[in-house]
């Protein structure tokens, strides 16, 4: 039951984790205007990773999308690359974590499919967790650069009398939210993890012993890994005929009581 | 069609307040931010602040800050603006006028202006 | 606060003749996010409210005769009537739209000869 709730809860929380990539992703507001300190415009900027914007006073928007490949900084790439990858990798995680709960009965899947199943969306979770902190990260420490560059020439004489303030730019909402996200996924990757384990328990190698008691020799028949829903025997869903065992193959798995929540 | 109409001229005495108001119609009121500027006699254009109607946010021009009130009515599309401690140098047309949409914060119909004369 | 400054004071043209008044900021009035020009020109006619002409330095308001014509970036601007006409007569003002508090220059008033 523990174990059902645990993945039950890894997989929420991944899913949170990974909408909110998405929209980290999507928004326009990865570096804002900084208005601290900063003379007071008329117009508010904001850029995300596919455009920039202008709002003006009035309220009225204008987006233009970064239409060149070339032109754009490597870093930008970097981020944009890191964030796609989280992405991808986590809808696979949710579509694989999905076949893997133990709430959901799919034909004949075995536990021990549903434990390797698990595990491998808890890594993949994991990564994609991973990919967004880390793309969030080193937008935010590009922001930083550049923000203490622009400080220091935060006036540009053009000649003269005049000069030219330059926009300096501060954390957006996006990287916030792409922290928290990538974070909710890589805890619900962690506890995808913890899940499997409690899914495939350590066992003996050896399934089955047959005895012989009028003979000297001991016939071990093993057995491949086996997952079960709990830490006890598992032999509750095994046909056992005379006392013999049967090898992994062969066992017919039928749900329990357990296996609905 | 848009209208900004402004209230009669007024006299008033150093030291005292003036209120003018600004009656919208046309428009949707609330949506658009409207601006106070005045115009001393063969002097140019000042800008004293703007409020918008939709929530009552205000932005004041530092020079009038403390003398300066920006309130609107939106049951009547009204926007007033009182001045207080009112100086000689105060004498001038004032126009509130309304912020265009997507017109580079730029004004875009204008009030026929209210005549306040600062005399002792 | 921004200081906009507009030349000639004055000028007195023949009809049909061309005229440019210019505007100088004293910082740039360009939003490097959108690349557009923060500054807008305004006609004022003698007893009249302004009038909007130009919004972002080039952008003519709808209903203004095409004859106007405003350029310029950055810090320094231009309006131009290629064809002076008799109801041209007014001053022009050109207001700094970017910054706060917004400021207008001392305007340019336009005669016929």
């Known amino acids: 039951m523990a174990v059902t709730a645990c993945q039950g809860l890894g997989f929420v929380v991944s899913l949170i984790g990974i909408a909110g990539i998405i929209a980290a992703t999507c928004m326009d507001q990865w570096s804002t205007q900084d208005l601290y300190n900063n003379p007071v415009t008329a117009v508010f900027n904001y850029q995300g990773l596919w455009r920039s914007c202008v709002r003006e006073s009035s309220g009225f928007t204008e987006c233009r999308g970064y239409f060149t490949l070339l032109g754009l900084p490597a870093m930008l790439q970097a981020v944009r690359a890191l964030m796609i990858v989280g992405i991808v990798l986590g809808a696979i995680g949710l579509l694989v974590s999905i076949f893997a709960l133990k709430c959901i009965r799919i034909g004949s899947m075995e536990d021990s499919a549903k434990a390797n199943m698990t595990l491998t969306s808890g890594i993949m979770f994991i990564v994609s967790g991973l990919c967004a902190i880390a793309g969030v990260s080193v937008f935010a420490n590009m922001l930083v650069t550049n923000f203490w560059m622009s400080t220091a020439n935060m006036y540009t004489g053009m000649g003269g009398m005049v000069q030219t303030v330059q926009t300096r730019y501060t954390f957006g909402a996006a990287l916030f939210v792409g922290w928290v996200a990538g974070g909710l996924t890589l805890i619900g990757g962690v506890m995808m993890c913890i899940a499997c384990r409690g899914l495939a328990p350590e066992e003996t190698n050896y399934k089955a012993v047959s005895y012989h008691a009028s003979g000297h020799s001991v016939a071990y028949k093993p057995g491949g890994f086996k997952a079960s829903t709990g830490f006890g025997s598992n032999t509750k869903n095994k046909k056992i005929y005379d006392g013999g065992a049967r090898t992994e193959d062969e066992v017919q798995s039928y749900p329990s009581k357990h296996d609905y929540v | 069609q848009v209208q900004l109409v402004q209230s009669g001229a007024e006299v008033k005495k150093p030291g005292a307040s003036v209120k003018v108001s600004c009656k919208a119609s046309?428009?949707?009121?609330?949506?658009?931010?409207i601006h106070w500027v005045r115009q001393a006699p063969g002097q140019g254009l000042e800008w004293m602040g703007r409020?918008?109607?939709?929530?009552?946010?205000?932005y004041y021009n530092e020079k009038f800050t403390g003398r300066v009130t920006m309130t609107r009515d939106t049951s009547t599309s009204t926007v007033y603006m009182e001045l207080s401690s009112l100086r000689s140098e105060d004498t001038a047309v004032y126009y509130c006028?309304?912020?265009?949409?997507?017109?580079?914060?730029?004004?875009?119909?204008w009030g026929q202006g209210t005549t306040v004369t600062v005399s002792s | 606060d921004i200081v906009m400054t507009q030349s000639p004071d004055s000028l007195a043209v023949s009809l049909g003749e061309r005229v440019t008044m210019n505007c100088k900021s004293s910082?740039?009035?360009?939003?490097?996010?959108?690349?557009?020009?923060?500054l807008t020109w305004y006609q004022q006619k003698p007893g009249q409210p302004p009038k909007l002409l130009f919004y972002?330095?080039?952008t003519r308001e709808s209903g203004v005769p095409d004859r106007f014509s405003g350029s310029g970036s950055g810090t320094d601007f231009t309006l131009t009537i290629s064809s002076v006409q008799a109801e041209d007569v007014a001053v022009y003002h050109c207001?700094?739209?970017?910054?706060?508090?917004?400021?207008f220059g001392g305007g340019t008033k336009l005669e016929i000869k």
């Open positions: 006028a309304r912020e265009g949409y997507g017109k580079g914060n730029s004004m875009d119909y």
């Open positions: 409020i918008y109607p939709g929530t009552g946010n205000t």
């Open positions: 046309g428009y949707i009121f609330t949506n658009y931010w």
């Open positions: 910082q740039s009035l360009l939003n490097a996010g959108n690349q557009k020009n923060y």
């Open positions: 972002w330095a080039s």
């Open positions: 207001q700094n739209a970017y910054y706060y508090p917004y400021t």
